[in-house]
Interface confidence: low
């Protein structure tokens, strides 16, 4: 058993029907010595008496808020949460496996640049009685500071019969060094509590591996005289690291007909303009990627040929 | 050329070669389904590689003030990786495919290090750790880890030379 925060404790349990469970001793936080009774959750039934209460925690029925009273007055509370270990593996019931980029991916993180700011998000089908707390650091043995905000509900989607809820959090490395080559990964730890169930999820990554630039901005077409060709131009997204001579992007320009089946013409360039043939009813799209490190491409920025 | 005395390197040549290094490093080890090699316990393997750190002056401001610190660090790393790619980690079993880009990568590392330090001038180089994995599968894993680490290193080097070519060339 360990303390998650004041008056909230996590009991780690091997989870199978005839598991012996954990013996937990609760102590009433009071100078009083006698006349103390205990209840669990909202029941009026007394579980035991005395300054300490020993309970065998075997399943969720034994978790909850234990309250000690004296003469009708509440003295203190201890909330017991359970952390289940099934066949040697900690449970992951609260969050959905996003399966991208690999199985057992519960947290996904992205950064728009090298400033040390990144966003992580996760999915759940649970709508109520749910709390998250996020901690992060650079490295684990001698951790350097990363400050994370509060996790917030960022999206709701309907998936078949189920509603899916997306939560996200923004974090910022305290002393980021955008130009350095990372040697220690960022560690992100999310504590999740649903009713009386506690789970924790972790992710470890280098900022360079989670970079996904915003799409190029100010995408414009300039027709070339007496030609079907157009000059496409664009700019670096505002959120990309500067100076651009140092933090350079490479671009992919695509001409796509109205029909998805039509052949796509693609041009790769390090410049912020390109000359392409603009077909009728086609659209021109441009996306960006770090020029020197193959992290994710940005989403497409698009304009119609007409 | 980045002579230890302090004259400027051939920024544009270095830029071109370092960008080629980036391409080669990624073609030698593309992102295999985002294979997370950090899970494979890399303490003793890639911890000793020279990293371009915050105080090495490889940021735009540091390059403007004095590019020599950064270039020395890059040179150190190039020599280190060049030796690793020439070691039995890459030459031993399982043999690399004949068309593997590792050979080109090895040659380009050497080429860039020579651009930075011509014959007769010497910067301190870092000792290469004695890594001799016994099993072919260990060697394979180590190759992946070294290439992943090299990708990060050459990305920073390429940024340095691109910025130098754009802002510091005579």
């Amino acid at each position: 058993i360990w303390e998650l925060k004041k008056d909230v404790y996590v009991v780690e349990l091997d989870w199978y029907p005839d598991a012996p469970g954990e013996m937990v001793v609760l102590t009433c936080d009071t100078p009083e010595e006698d006349g103390i009774t205990w209840t669990l959750d909202q029941s009026s039934e007394v579980l035991g008496s005395g300054k300490t209460l020993t309970i065998q925690v075997k399943e969720f029925g034994d978790a909850g808020q234990y309250t000690c009273h004296k003469g009708g007055e509440v003295l203190s509370h201890s909330l017991l949460l359970l952390h289940k270990k099934e066949d040697g593996i900690w449970s992951t019931d609260i969050l959905k496996d996003q399966k991208e980029p690999k199985n057992k991916t519960f947290l996904r993180c992205e950064a728009k640049n090298y400033s040390g700011r990144f966003t992580c998000w996760w999915l759940t089908t649970i709508s109520t009685d749910l709390t998250f707390s996020v901690k992060s650091s650079r490295g684990s043995s001698d951790p350097q500071g990363v400050t994370c905000g509060a996790a917030t509900l960022s999206a709701e989607r309907v998936r078949g019969d189920n509603k899916e809820y997306e939560y996200s959090v923004e974090c910022q490395e305290d002393s980021a060094c955008p130009a350095a080559e990372e040697s220690l990964p960022i560690e992100v730890m999310v504590d999740a509590v649903h009713k009386l169930k506690y789970e924790n999820y972790t992710s470890s990554f280098f900022i360079r591996d989670i970079i996904k630039p915003d799409p190029p901005k100010n995408l414009q077409l300039k027709p070339l005289k007496n030609s079907r060709q157009v000059e496409v131009s664009w700019e670096y997204p505002d959120t990309w690291s500067t100076p651009h001579s140092y933090f350079s992007l490479t671009f992919c320009v695509q001409v796509q007909g109205k029909s998805k089946r039509e052949k796509k013409d693609r041009v790769f360039t390090d410049k912020t303009s390109a000359t392409v043939i603009c077909r009728k009813n086609a659209s021109i799209s441009v996306r960006a990627q770090d020029r020197y490190y193959s992290s994710s491409w940005s989403e497409w920025a698009s304009v119609p040929c007409s | 050329r980045a002579v230890p005395g302090g004259s400027s390197p051939a920024w544009t040549q270095c830029q071109q070669l370092s960008q080629k290094l980036c391409t080669l490093a990624w073609s030698a080890h593309p992102l295999v389904g985002h294979m997370d090699l950090r899970e494979e316990g890399d303490e003793e393997t890639t911890n000793d590689v020279p990293h371009i750190q915050c105080g090495d002056g490889c940021d735009p401001q540091g390059l403007r003030d004095n590019s020599q610190f950064c270039l020395q660090r890059i040179h150190q790393g190039l020599i280190f990786y060049e030796k690793l790619l020439g070691s039995d980690i890459f030459t031993g079993e399982p043999s690399l495919l004949p068309d593997s880009p590792v050979g080109q990568l090895h040659a380009s590392l050497l080429g860039l290090s020579q651009l930075l330090q011509p014959e007769g001038h010497h910067w301190e180089t870092q000792q290469i750790p004695s890594l001799s994995p016994s099993q072919p599968w260990q060697r394979l894993l180590l190759r992946f880890k070294i290439l992943r680490s090299l990708q990060a290193f050459v990305a920073v080097a390429a940024r340095v030379f691109a910025h130098g070519a754009a802002t510091l060339s005579p």
Epitope: W15, Y16, D18, G21, E59, G61, E86, D87 | -
Partner: antibody, heavy 114, light 107 residues
Framework: QELKESGGRLVTPGGSLTLSCTAS????????MTWVRQAPGKGLEWMGV??????LNYASWAQGRFTISKPSSTTVDLKMTSLTTEDTATYFC??????????WGPGTLVTVSS | DVVMTQTPSSTSAAVGGTVTIKCQAS??????LAWYQQKPGQPPKPLIV???ILTSGVPSRFKGSRSGTEYTLTISGVQREDAATYYC?????????FGGGTELEIL
């Protein structure tokens, strides 16, 4: 998300029968799986449980003649031997009978008659 | 094995009335107690787990409580759709037993 029992049929006294419980769209791995039966017009009878780690527990009256097994991650079987007319009942399988998300199959009817 | 003694075996109530069903465990079973509702031709449906915790979607007129080894299901403001047989399920985490059932008729 459902459980479905199968294998119920008419058997003669002294015969044997194996019932299967198949899960679709849900996981059994993290749960205990229980077999319960109900004779026509009578109450529910708890028979036995197979735990996550494969631990087996039976009601004392069910010990010996009934065997629960888990041949795969999506199926749980109940093997019944030396059947008597008293064993005529609807047999249910249930996932996690003590948990709020307990799921039960619709039941399968076993008739023991000569 | 734990023996669960359920009373009464049948009861009736008018719409809006209150019904109380009790289960006595032969030994201490902590929170290993659930209440089930069964309608003809259907599998049982869990109403309350952990002696007093209402399961998702169950109306708040159903209430479970526990005193020592006696467990009580109270239905306040009975509705027509509550006509069913109610069972308690209790155990020690290893072996369990159902109570004999209580048939509720709505007058």
């Amino acid at each position: 998300q459902e459980l479905k029992e199968s294998g119920g049929r008419l058997v003669t006294p002294g015969g044997s029968l194996t019932l299967s419980c198949t899960a679709s769209g849900l996981t059994l791995g993290s749960y205990s799986m229980t077999w319960v039966r109900q004779a026509p017009g009578k109450g529910l009878e708890w028979m036995g449980v197979i735990g996550v780690g494969g631990t087996l527990n039976y009601a004392s009256w069910a010990q010996g003649r009934f065997t629960i097994s888990k041949p795969s991650s999506t199926t749980v079987d109940l093997k019944m031997t030396s059947l008597t007319t008293e064993d005529t009942a609807t047999y249910f399988c249930a996932r996690g009978t003590y948990s709020g998300d307990s799921i039960w199959g619709p039941g399968t009817l076993v008739t023991v008659s000569s | 094995d734990v023996v669960m003694t359920q009373t009464p075996s049948s009861t009736s109530a008018a719409v809006g009335g209150t019904v109380t069903i009790k289960c006595q465990a032969s030994q201490s079973i902590s929170s290993w107690l659930a209440w089930y509702q069964q309608k003809p031709g259907q599998p049982p449906k869990p109403l309350i787990v952990r002696a007093s915790i209402l399961t998702s979607g169950v109306p708040s007129r159903f209430k479970g409580s526990r005193s020592g080894t006696e467990y009580t299901l109270t239905i306040s403001g009975v509705q027509r759709e509550d006509a069913a047989t109610y069972y308690c399920l209790g155990g020690d985490g290893h072996v369990s037993n159902f109570g004999g059932g209580t048939e509720l008729e709505i007058l």
